[in-house]
Interface confidence: medium
C-alpha cells in the first residue's frame, strides 16, 4: 500500500494509487471496517471525485483507506496507509514529515511545493526555510514554486511551503517540506600525475623494502572511469607473478587546490638485482585518456665515509 | 588481427538475467576501454556501460544503474556485460565494443575516442 | 545528459552525389585540454556491427575511404560522402564521447535516389 501523511488541524487531500487515467468512479471505505466514506461536503472527511478529503485532519484519522475502482468489466482495489501526525513542537522536521529532496546546481534553482496540485490552493504561497520566512529578493516565489538566485551551499537545509486551501467557504492551511541540497558543479579533466615525476629514477637498497607512489589528478566531482595503476614492463602488477611485488589499491585524495586525486602505491618487499631491470608504469586514465610516467630503479650508492 | 567474438543468441524470461561475454585477441586487453552498446529492433544505438580493464573501474548508464554488471578478465581477455531484472524493453542485439587510442609521443598521453573495434553482436530476446 | 540531434533522418541522393548528414549537440564537446573535439561518426548497414568512420570530428579512421569527411567544432558538425557509391548505402550515426553518458543521434538513414 502507499503512503501519505498530513499535520493535525490541517487540510489533506490524497489520491487513489490505482486510479491511472481512469475516469470511473472511486469509493473509498475505511479497511478496517469496511465503512463507505459519503460525498457529503458537510462532513469533516469526505469523498470527491478520484479524492479523499480531510478537513481538516485529525490524529484518529489514521489508518488504512481502501478505494475501488468500478469499470464495467474490473473492479480495482488500491490501499493508503494515511498518517496523521502532531505538529512538532520544536523547528526540526523530523524525516517522516519530509518529502523528496530537491538537489540544485548552478545560478538558479527551482523548489516545487509538495502535493500542492491536489489541493484548490490561491497564491501567494509562503516559504519558510528551517522556520524562518525568506525575504531576502534572492528568494522569489512564483506560482507553485520558489526560485533561488545565485545558489550557494548556504542555501541547503529545509524549506516549507505554506498554502490555503478553500472549500465550501472555509480556508484550510497546508504545510509541506522538503530538503534542499546544493550539488557543485564538477569539472573533469585530462589525468594529471603529480607523481612521480616524468621518467624519474629511482634508488633503492638491495633487499631492503621499496614503495612508490603513483598520484594523478582528475578535476573536482563528478568523475567517470577515474584510475591509478602500476603497470611493470606494461603488465599489470596482478598478472606480473611477482609475490614480492603488490599493489595496494588506489585512495581518494583531495589535492591542495581542491582536486580529486587518487593514489595507488606499488610495495616492493625486498628489492633485487632483476627488479633493477624493470620498466614500472604509473598510469592514469579516465573517460578522456589516458597517461603514463615510466620510473626506473637504481642501486643507492653508498656513502663514502673516508 | 585485432577481434572481438561474442558469445551467442540468448533468449530468457521477464525477471531473469542474461550474461553475455566477448572475447577480445590482437591486442593488449588491458590498454583499452570496453563498451557496451545496444540495439532493440529498428532503433538506433544506446550506450549501456563501460570498464577500464587494466583498473577495473565501470560506469554505466543511468538508465541501466542497479541492473547491469560490466567485468572483465584479464586472464581470458574477455569482458562480461550482465543485465538482470530483465523486461521485454530489454530485447536487443548486444554490442562490445574497444575504445579508441590515440598516442601522442610528446607527454606519454593516450587520447581515448569513440569505438574502433565492434563485436559481432548478441542477440538477447526476453519473452514469456 | 548530452543530446544529439541528427538532420535529416532519411535521405535519398542519386549515385555520384554529394550527401550530407549533420549533427548537433545540447552542449559543447570540444575539450580544452587537448582542443579536441570529442565526436566521432559511425556507419551501419544492415545485419551488421557499426563502423568507425570519423573521430575527433574530423580524423578519418583508417582503411576509410577519402569520400567521408567531417567538419564542425563546438556543438554543429557534419559527415559529407562527397560521391555517393551504392556501398555507401547504411545508416549513420554521430556520438559524442566528452561526458558521461556516451550518447548517439537517432540515425540519418542513406538511400540512393
Known amino acids: 500500500s502507499k503512503s501519505s501523511w498530513g499535520l493535525e488541524n490541517e487540510a489533506l487531500i490524497v489520491r487513489c494509487p490505482q486510479r491511472g487515467r481512469s475516469t470511473y468512479p472511486v469509493e473509498w471505505y475505511y479497511s478496517d471496517t469496511n465503512e463507505s466514506i459519503p460525498t457529503q461536503k458537510r462532513n469533516r472527511i469526505f469523498v470527491s471525485r478520484d479524492r479523499l478529503k480531510f478537513l481538516p485532519a485529525r490524529v484518529e484519522d489514521s489508518g488504512i483507506y481502501a478505494c475501488v475502482i468500478r469499470s464495467p468489466n474490473l473492479n480495482k482495489t488500491g490501499y493508503l496507509n494515511v498518517t496523521i501526525h502532531k505538529k512538532p513542537p520544536s523547528c526540526n522536521i523530523p524525516d517522516y514529515l519530509m518529502y523528496s529532496t530537491v538537489r540544485g546546481s548552478d545560478k538558479n534553482f527551482k523548489i516545487t511545493c509538495p502535493t500542492i496540485d491536489l489541493y484548490n490552493w490561491t497564491a501567494p504561497v509562503q516559504w519558510f526555510k528551517n522556520c524562518k520566512a525568506l525575504q531576502e529578493p534572492r528568494f522569489r516565489a512564483h506560482r507553485s514554486y520558489l526560485f533561488i538566485d545565485n545558489v550557494t551551499h548556504d542555501d541547503e537545509g529545509d524549506y516549507t511551503c505554506q498554502f490555503t486551501h478553500a472549500e465550501n467557504g472555509t480556508n484550510y492551511i497546508v504545510t509541506a517540506t522538503r530538503s534542499f541540497t546544493v550539488e557543485e558543479k564538477g569539472f573533469s579533466m585530462f589525468p594529471v600525475i603529480t607523481n612521480p615525476p616524468y621518467n624519474h629514477t629511482m634508488e633503492v637498497e638491495i633487499g631492503k623494502p621499496a614503495s612508490i607512489a603513483c598520484s594523478a589528478c582528475f578535476g573536482k566531482g563528478s568523475h567517470f572511469l577515474a584510475d591509478v595503476l602500476w603497470q611493470i614492463n606494461k603488465t599489470v602488477v596482478g598478472n606480473f607473478g611477482e609475490a614480492r611485488i603488490q599493489e595496494e589499491e588506489g585512495r581518494n585524495e583531495s589535492s591542495s587546490n581542491d582536486m580529486d586525486c587518487l593514489t595507488s602505491v606499488l610495495r616492493i618487499t625486498g628489492v633485487t638485482e632483476k627488479d633493477l631491470s624493470l620498466e614500472y608504469d604509473c598510469l592514469a586514465l579516465n573517460l578522456h585518456g589516458m597517461i603514463r610516467h615510466t620510473i626506473r630503479l637504481r642501486r643507492k650508492q653508498p656513502i663514502d665515509h673516508r | 588481427q585485432v577481434q572481438l567474438v561474442q558469445s551467442g543468441a540468448e533468449v530468457k524470461k521477464p525477471g531473469s538475467s542474461v550474461k553475455v561475454s566477448c572475447k577480445a585477441s590482437?591486442?593488449?586487453?588491458?590498454?583499452?576501454?570496453m563498451h557496451w552498446v545496444r540495439q532493440a529492433p529498428g532503433q538506433g544505438l544506446e550506450w549501456v556501460g563501460v570498464?577500464?580493464?587494466?583498473?577495473?573501474?565501470?560506469t554505466y548508464a543511468q538508465t541501466f544503474q542497479g541492473r547491469v554488471t560490466i567485468t572483465a578478465d584479464e586472464s581470458t581477455s574477455t569482458a562480461y556485460m550482465e543485465l538482470s531484472s530483465l523486461r521485454s524493453e530489454d530485447t536487443a542485439v548486444y554490442y562490445c565494443?574497444?575504445?579508441?587510442?590515440?598516442?601522442?609521443?610528446?607527454?606519454?598521453?593516450?587520447?581515448?575516442?569513440?569505438?574502433?573495434?565492434w563485436g559481432q553482436g548478441t542477440t538477447v530476446t526476453v519473452s514469456s | 545528459d548530452i543530446v544529439m540531434t541528427q538532420s535529416p533522418d532519411s535521405l535519398a541522393v542519386s549515385l555520384g552525389e554529394r550527401a550530407t548528414i549533420n549533427c548537433k549537440s545540447s552542449?559543447?564537446?570540444?575539450?580544452?585540454?587537448?582542443?579536441?573535439?570529442?565526436l566521432a561518426w559511425y556507419q551501419q548497414k544492415p545485419g551488421q556491427p557499426p563502423k568507425l568512420l570519423i573521430y575527433?570530428?574530423?580524423t578519418r579512421e583508417s582503411g576509410v575511404p577519402d569520400r567521408f569527411s567531417g567538419s564542425g567544432s563546438g556543438t554543429d558538425f557534419t559527415l559529407t560522402i562527397s560521391s555517393l557509391q551504392a556501398e555507401d548505402v547504411a545508416v549513420y550515426y554521430c556520438?559524442?564521447?566528452?561526458?558521461?553518458?556516451?550518447?548517439f543521434g537517432q540515425g540519418t538513414k542513406v538511400e540512393i535516389k
Open positions: 590482437g591486442y593488449t586487453f588491458t590498454d583499452y576501454q
Open positions: 575527433w570530428a574530423s
Open positions: 570498464i577500464n580493464p587494466g583498473g577495473g573501474s565501470t
Open positions: 556520438q559524442q564521447y566528452y561526458s558521461i553518458p556516451v550518447t
Open positions: 565494443a574497444r575504445g579508441g587510442v590515440e598516442y601522442s609521443s610528446s607527454w606519454d598521453y593516450y587520447y581515448y575516442y569513440g569505438m574502433d573495434v
Open positions: 552542449q559543447s564537446v570540444l575539450y580544452r585540454s587537448n582542443n579536441k573535439n570529442y
